[in-house]
């Protein structure tokens, strides 16, 4: 029998992590593999047809998006849908396909709703979610007693999708669930000066524990306007939530683990500034298996796509899509087994949820509502050299916070700051008015 | 309610090996580096070694490098060290400790200890 | 290695009594620094960690100051229960290093 794969991905747009030229070639490998494996779909052909989500611009559209799912649908008749990938255009071919009761599997689509199976019925998501974000910043938040307040704020540029509002309604959203904590949230503009001023005002008065989703070069200036207003000292944490690493990769950008590094004159006082800051990002998968993979998606995107794929935890969204289809084509070859058919999208689905799989990414179990527990990486300055590394890794699966680095993390006072001043926000604690006025008297 | 309990130690001639193990509990294991320290009888303490929850880095103090091995098995939430080639100066109490790196508490749990005697 | 110098070695004190110890380490180590009681036949106790942080669990008469190379442990009204030897260790870098310990003896 044939088994159809309708794409639905930015065909020409290379720079999204689930563009076609890096999506492309782990499908090819996921493709080869089951032709290689017996056990699976024996005796079929896959095959897969594209349709684009991005407009003539070669930006992400909500429009093009449905109108390239319906068209697939309705001229070949797919057993799945792989992507899209970019929230806006996620989110209308996803209400499609659980109309027509097609699955929808992407490692895309991060956006707390997605998560909501009533309206996004049989979609997967292979890769990482932002509410999972939030299951690892609870999970941070009750080690170190952080349960009363956070601060977050997110960048907004034209024409990134929203990237950050998204990610932090994930957090927001799940860390509020997790712990009985007050969070307020902010949202900046990346280009304009006079809102970082703005924020600076604000934040003594919100929070401790900072969370910033921006752009390296908006956090670093973030960074450095907060060291001249005097709340990069030992009191103030600031997270930057950089999922994919990008402050921290070398090329073009700063040097390697040194995010505050740029060669322009303020490197002694961002470096002071770093101090304070602390970066999440996605876990870089660290088993054999995934560099193999790596070595092997680079010479095929380069091979077949004339595409240069570049190092970095973008990649791991490619090798997210190769693991979801072979565990869809296993779920697929289980259901065929079973007496069912291709076209039993529920069946098929409900046998690719709550359940664990060794891919190319490493372990990676897919939990009850057909999202994958994610591993995240927490990175810390070694006072020494200025350098970042990897301090502590959460485990999506077990949800433990795992101890990497054999030394304590880089905290200005030797421990961590309280989530709330000594004496509230607003001095309003009565222990410290009193002390006030008896030295008054 | 967070413990340790050390295991294996005894009497071994020099040069010989003995197997150490700290069976922990009542805590996220994975989530603290964890380490060996040692007291000889009537003397200071000495710390030995330790090893990350992501078994990614280990620490020995000079005296033991290249004798000592520091291992975990995070699925039994065990510690353990390996002593080979045992000298008279290893006689001690060996403790098994935690350290949590993520607030700065260093040692803040610690086992009974177990007695290694080096002697022929 | 970072080098641990405590002083006195040991003192002896009555209850009541207000008793300092101090540690020098031989480099700067910040505040990654802490401080321990152990009593004849049991396991050490952690009392201050990160040079003046107090432990959950131990009473207040016990506290810590200093950073950089100098490190002070004082108990204020000395009870019969702190008779004890003290240790101060540095976490700044490995290896890790023990001062060489303060007995507290009943004067």
């Known amino acids: 029998g044939n088994l159809t794969v309708a794409v639905v991905l930015p065909l020409a747009n290379t720079s999204y992590p689930w563009s076609w030229a890096r999506v492309g070639p782990a499908v090819e490998l996921a493709l080869a593999q089951v032709k290689a494996r017996p056990d699976l779909l024996p005796g079929w052909t896959v095959r897969t047809v594209l349709g684009s989500s991005e407009n003539a611009l070669g930006v992400c559209s909500d429009t093009a998006a449905p109108l390239a799912a319906v068209d697939l649908k309705w001229e070949h008749n797919p057993a799945v849908f792989l992507g899209p990938g970019c929230v806006y255009a996620a989110a209308p071919v996803g209400r499609f396909t659980a109309h027509w009761r097609v699955p929808l599997l992407t490692a895309g689509a991060p956006a707390l709703g997605f998560g909501v199976k009533d309206e996004y019925a049989l979609t997967t998501r292979a890769g990482p979610s932002y509410a999972k974000l939030g299951d690892f910043v609870a999970a941070l938040h009750r080690r170190l007693g952080w349960e009363r307040q956070a601060l977050m704020l997110y960048a907004y540029r034209p024409g990134d999708e929203e990237h950050c509002f998204f990610l932090v309604e994930g957090l927001f959203m799940r860390v509020r669930d997790r712990l009985n904590i007050t969070v307020d949230h902010l949202e900046f503009a990346e280009d304009d000066l006079s809102h970082y001023t703005r924020l600076l005002r604000t934040m003594p008065r919100k929070g401790r524990v900072i969370y910033i989703c921006s752009s390296p070069d908006a956090f670093r200036t973030l960074m450095l306007l907060a060291l001249e207003a005097g709340l990069c000292g030992e009191d103030y944490v600031f997270f930057h939530l950089d999922i994919f690493g990008q402050s921290l990769q070398g090329g073009q950008g700063p040097a390697p683990r040194r995010p505050w590094e740029r060669g322009d004159g303020q490197d002694v006082s961002a470096r002071q500034a770093f101090q304070a800051a602390k970066i999440i990002t996605y876990k870089d998968p660290d088993n054999p298996e995934y560099l193999e993979f790596l070595k092997q998606l680079k010479h095929l995107a380069y091979e077949q796509f004339n595409f240069t794929m570049e190092d970095g935890l973008v990649n791991t969204i490619p090798a997210s899509f190769h693991d979801g289809l072979l565990l869809y084509i296993q779920a697929v070859t289980e259901t065929l087994a079973h007496g069912g058919t291709v076209t039993d999208g529920e069946n098929i689905t409900q046998r690719m949820w709550n359940r664990s799989f060794q891919g190319v990414t490493g372990y990676l179990k897919i939990d009850s509502s057909g999202d994958r527990e994610t591993d995240f990486s927490l990175w810390d300055m070694d006072p020494e050299n200025g350098a970042f590394r990897v301090v502590l890794n959460y485990n999506g699966t077990s949800q433990e916070l795992v101890a990497v680095s054999g030394r304590k993390l880089n905290w200005p006072l030797g421990y961590p700051p309280p989530d709330i001043p000594k004496c509230g926000f607003d001095n309003e604690d009565p222990a410290c008015n009193q002390d006030h006025l008896s030295t008054l008297e | 309610e967070v413990q340790l309990v050390e295991s294996g130690g005894g009497l071994v001639q020099p040069g010989g090996s003995l197997r150490l193990s700290c069976a922990a509990s009542g805590f996220s294991f994975v989530s603290y580096v964890m380490g060996w320290v040692r007291q000889a009888p009537g003397k200071g303490l000495e710390w030995v070694s330790s090893?990350?929850?992501?078994?990614?880095?280990?620490y020995y103090a000079d005296p033991v490098k290249g004798r000592f091995t520091i291992s975990r098995d995070n699925s039994k939430n065990t510690l353990y060290l390996q002593m080979n080639s045992l000298r008279a100066e290893d006689t001690a109490a060996y403790y098994c400790v935690t350290y949590d790196i993520l607030t700065g508490h260093l040692f803040d749990y610690w086992g009974q200890g177990t007695l290694v005697t080096v002697s022929s | 290695a970072i080098q641990m110098t405590q002083s006195p070695s040991s003192l002896s004190a009555s209850v009541g009594d207000r008793v300092t110890i101090t540690c020098r380490s031989s480099q700067g180590i910040r505040n990654d620094f802490g401080w321990y009681q152990q009593k004849p036949g049991k396991a050490p106790k952690l009392l201050i960690y990160?040079?003046?942080r107090l432990q959950s669990g131990v009473p207040s008469r016990f506290s810590g100051s200093g950073s950089g190379t100098d490190f002070t442990l004082t108990i204020n009204n000395l009870q019969p229960e702190d008779f004890a030897t003290y240790y101060c260790?540095?976490?700044?870098?490995?290896?890790?290093?023990f001062g060489p310990g303060t007995k507290v003896d009943i004067k």
């Open positions: 260790l540095q976490d700044y870098t490995y290896p890790f290093t």
């Open positions: 990160a040079a003046s």
């Open positions: 090893i990350s929850g992501s078994l990614t880095n280990t």
